[in-house]
């Protein structure tokens, strides 16, 4: 079944102004790529490359397309039914706990550790202790000996908004 988005599902800044609120019309909703008119009678297309809606909805306006930040590459453009997909540039990654920016991947592992995972757009390189095999979560490699690695370039997105 198709998901639907209503006014109540939106963050406060995305909701219509109070005077624009209206009850759903009997036929109800507009398709993805559209929003509903203020009188609830018509469906209005989102503007290609400017805004979008992903589900059947009774929104009074479409959602603004995301613009990729510097340090990000655009994997796919915004259409009327899907938001822009941005991905961290090669050699950088975005963590769940700091989704607002891409951070540089470490160039290598601290001494006594080996690399078991490459830098990807959504994760730093992964290091484990040679003996125990336990993961290292430290931010910066030890200054002394590092095992260098070249950044990976997988194609899947690190942030899929929309």
């Amino acid at each position: 079944e198709s998901a639907l988005i209503t006014q109540q599902d939106l963050a406060p800044q995305q909701r219509a102004a109070p005077q624009q609120k209206r009850s759903s019309p009997s036929e109800g909703l507009c398709p993805p790529g559209h929003h509903i008119s203020e009188d609830g009678r018509d469906c209005i297309s989102c503007k290609y490359g400017q805004d979008y809606s992903t589900h059947w909805n009774d929104l009074l306006f479409c959602l603004r397309c995301t613009r990729c930040d510097s340090g990000e590459v655009e994997l796919s453009p915004c259409t009327t039914t899907r938001n822009t997909v941005c991905q961290c540039e090669e050699g950088t990654f975005r963590e769940e706990d700091s989704p607002e920016m891409c951070r540089k991947c470490r160039t290598g592992c601290p001494r006594g550790m080996v690399k078991v995972g490459d830098c990807t757009p959504w994760s730093d390189i992964e290091c484990v202790h040679k003996e125990s095999g336990t993961k290292h979560s430290g931010e910066v490699p030890a200054v002394e000996e590092t095992v260098t690695s070249s950044p990976g370039t997988p194609a899947s997105p690190c942030s899929l908004s929309g």
Epitope: S2, P31, P32, I44, S45, K47, Y48, W56, T79
Partner: antibody
């Protein structure tokens, strides 16, 4: 391949009703919106309304709202358009057409059903 | 409702000619315009959507342009099989509406 196969031609008297069917195949029925568009002889095209099987959403052109009813039978992937209180100016070819859940253009069309209203 | 006014309503051109059909919307429809080709006794076929995007399998001699209220369908080099009636359609706001059509024939 995608096919929209419509029912055969109909001749009706003024005041009567007609029900035209459109059987869809070659794609997932619940993922696309199906529309009815009509074309009077030698005239342009006129959008009548849609039905979306994914959530049973229906929208009618206000011009036809009081006389048209669009329904569907999901078990047979068929959409129906019933037009009541027929008048001579309803004589037209009625098409079903499909569109993705996005911009409202029609990528596949049925072959059309000629409905003639005559006393 | 938005009116779509097509011109000319009839057009005669020679094979190889560059042919242009225009469509004017009664209000701004952004780039939400599609073009269809309809041959006698057949259903319309989608050629162009979003004013300039060619539908799958449509020959490259067909192109579309425009935004706001003025739109154009161009056939760069007319072929005998292009004899048909061409319709524009706005898909910006319901009810979606069509132009009156342009009947194209070969001289």
């Amino acid at each position: 391949q995608v096919q929209l196969v419509q029912s055969g031609a109909e001749v009706k008297k003024p005041g009567a009703s007609v029900k035209v069917s459109c059987k869809a195949s070659g794609y997932t029925f619940t993922e696309y919106i199906l529309h009815w568009v009509r074309q009077a002889p030698g005239q342009g095209l006129e959008w009548m309304g849609w039905f979306y099987p994914g959530n049973n959403n229906i929208k009618y052109n206000e011009k036809f709202k009081d006389r048209v009813t669009i329904t569907a039978d999901k078990s047979t992937s068929t959409v129906y358009m019933e037009l009541s209180s027929l008048r001579s100016e309803d004589t037209a070819v009625y098409y079903c057409a499909r569109h993705e859940q996005g911009p409202g253009y029609f990528d596949y069309w049925g072959q059309g059903t000629l409905v003639t209203v005559s006393s | 409702d938005i009116q779509m006014t097509q011109s000319p309503s009839f057009l005669s051109a020679s094979v190889g000619d560059r042919v242009t059909i225009t469509c004017k919307a009664s209000q701004d429809v952004n780039t939400a315009v599609a073009w269809y080709q309809q041959k006698p006794g057949k259903a319309p076929k989608l050629l162009i959507y979003w004013a300039s995007t060619r539908h799958t399998g449509v020959p490259s001699r067909f192109s579309g342009s425009g935004s706001g209220t003025d739109f154009t369908l161009t056939i760069s080099s007319l072929q005998p099989e292009d004899v048909a009636t061409y319709y524009c359609q706005q898909h910006y706001i319901t009810p979606w509406t069509f132009g009156g059509g342009t009947k194209l024939e070969i001289k």
